[in-house]
């Protein structure tokens, strides 16, 4: 079996529902899984009239459709919640919507951190 993966150990973490779910709102997540299984990062978001609302980011369990994806790219046309996954540490920092019908590619950059 050819194995072309970038090992995923850590992902960007975000939870828009952090208060209700009693979690942190954002940060880094260390990925843990069963031995010999691959791990991925993911991002999910909504797009309301061009306004991007992050839903969640974090680690994602072994999923064949995530294998060998270096970038987090969602391809569904107009879902309620956009989803992408990728392999490699913090690969979910940026995420992209590239609709299958050939619409414009839209990449979402994380906001720059404020200078300290």
């Amino acid at each position: 079996s050819g194995r072309g993966e970038a090992e995923t150990r850590e992902c960007i973490y975000y939870n828009a529902n952090w208060e209700l779910e009693r979690t942190n709102q954002s940060g880094l997540e260390r990925c843990e899984g069963e031995q010999d299984k691959r791990l991925h990062c993911y991002a999910s978001w909504r797009n309301s009239s061009g306004t991007i609302e992050l839903v969640k980011k974090g680690c994602w369990l072994d999923d064949f459709n995530c294998y060998d994806r270096q970038e987090c790219v969602a391809t569904e046309e107009n879902p309620q919640v956009y989803f992408c996954c990728c392999e490699g540490n913090f690969c979910n920092e940026r995420f992209t919507h590239l609709p299958e019908a050939g619409g414009p590619e839209v990449t979402y950059e994380p906001p720059p951190t404020a200078p300290t």
Epitope: R3, D62, Y67
Partner: antibody
Framework: EVQLLESGGGLVQPGGSLRLSCAAS????????MSWVRQAPGKGLEWVSG????????FYTDSVKGRFTVSRDNSRNTLYLQMNSLRAEDTAVYYC???????????WGQGTLVTVSS | QTVVTQEPSFSVSPGGTVTLTCGFN?????????PSWYQQTPGQAPRTLIY???TRSSGVPDRFSGSILGNKAALTITGAQADDESDYYC??????????FGGGTKLTVLG
């Protein structure tokens, strides 16, 4: 509309070779993992092989390892299964299937029949 | 060698409810195996019914539902209809690039 069209099946003698193709349309092929599943006459479905979006990772069921090779041409939107050293027990309808998140088969082709017989 | 087990055959009366199960020899089936279910009628390609344990594929009527029952994945058909007479297959994702199909259940709708 998603379409998967297999071709390349036929009658082949034991020890012979065949190459199956699966032409994909209606979705961004390069962004989808793919798989082959087969069904022997009167039997159940059996997973055969899978290939990642880039083709960088390939996997096989034990009974075909070293004999079958899965590949893809993302510029031609086509999935392939090269089958060598064919045996009578490889006789089956071979389906290609698109893999979606949560590692399930969301679309299937209509299948192509491979018959291995002398 | 992982073996996924399903009831070889099952019968249900029209309008009745039937639950098909999917287990395996290496322990309990959990949602991390992302069980999925497929329906196949003779001479046809499989049709996707359920994925991610309990999510219906698009166009699948809500008479079909998926769950975990005890240590197995389950497919429940409520209000069975004549055209539900088919073979039903479960698939478990073992991870690391490997899927295993169950042997299938032949469902007969009586009458």
């Amino acid at each position: 509309e998603v379409q998967l069209l297999e071709s390349g099946g036929g009658l082949v003698q034991p020890g012979g070779s065949l190459r199956l193709s699966c032409a994909a349309s209606g979705f961004t092929f390069r962004n989808s993992a793919m798989s082959w599943v087969r069904q022997a006459p009167g039997k159940g479905l059996e997973w055969v092989s899978g290939i990642s979006v880039t083709g960088g990772s390939t996997f096989y069921t034990d009974s075909v390892k070293g004999r079958f090779t899965v590949s893809r041409d993302n510029s031609r939107n086509t999935l392939y299964l090269q089958m060598n050293s064919l045996r009578a027990e490889d006789t089956a309808v071979y389906y290609c299937a698109k893999v979606y998140y949560y590692s399930f088969f969301d679309y299937w082709g209509q299948g192509t029949l491979v018959t291995v017989s002398s | 060698q992982t073996v996924v087990t399903q009831e070889p055959s099952f019968s249900v009366s029209p309008g009745g409810t039937v639950t098909l199960t999917c287990g395996f020899n290496s322990g309990s089936v959990s949602t991390s195996y992302w069980p999925s279910w497929y329906q196949q009628t003779p001479g046809q390609a499989p049709r996707t019914l359920i994925y991610n344990t309990n999510t219906r594929s698009s166009g699948v009527p809500d008479r079909f539902s998926g769950s975990i029952l005890g240590n197995k994945a389950a497919l429940t058909i409520t209000g069975a209809q004549a055209d539900d007479e088919s073979d039903y297959y479960c698939v478990l994702w073992m991870g690391s690039g490997i899927w295993v199909f169950g042997g299938g259940t032949k469902l007969t709708v009586l009458g």
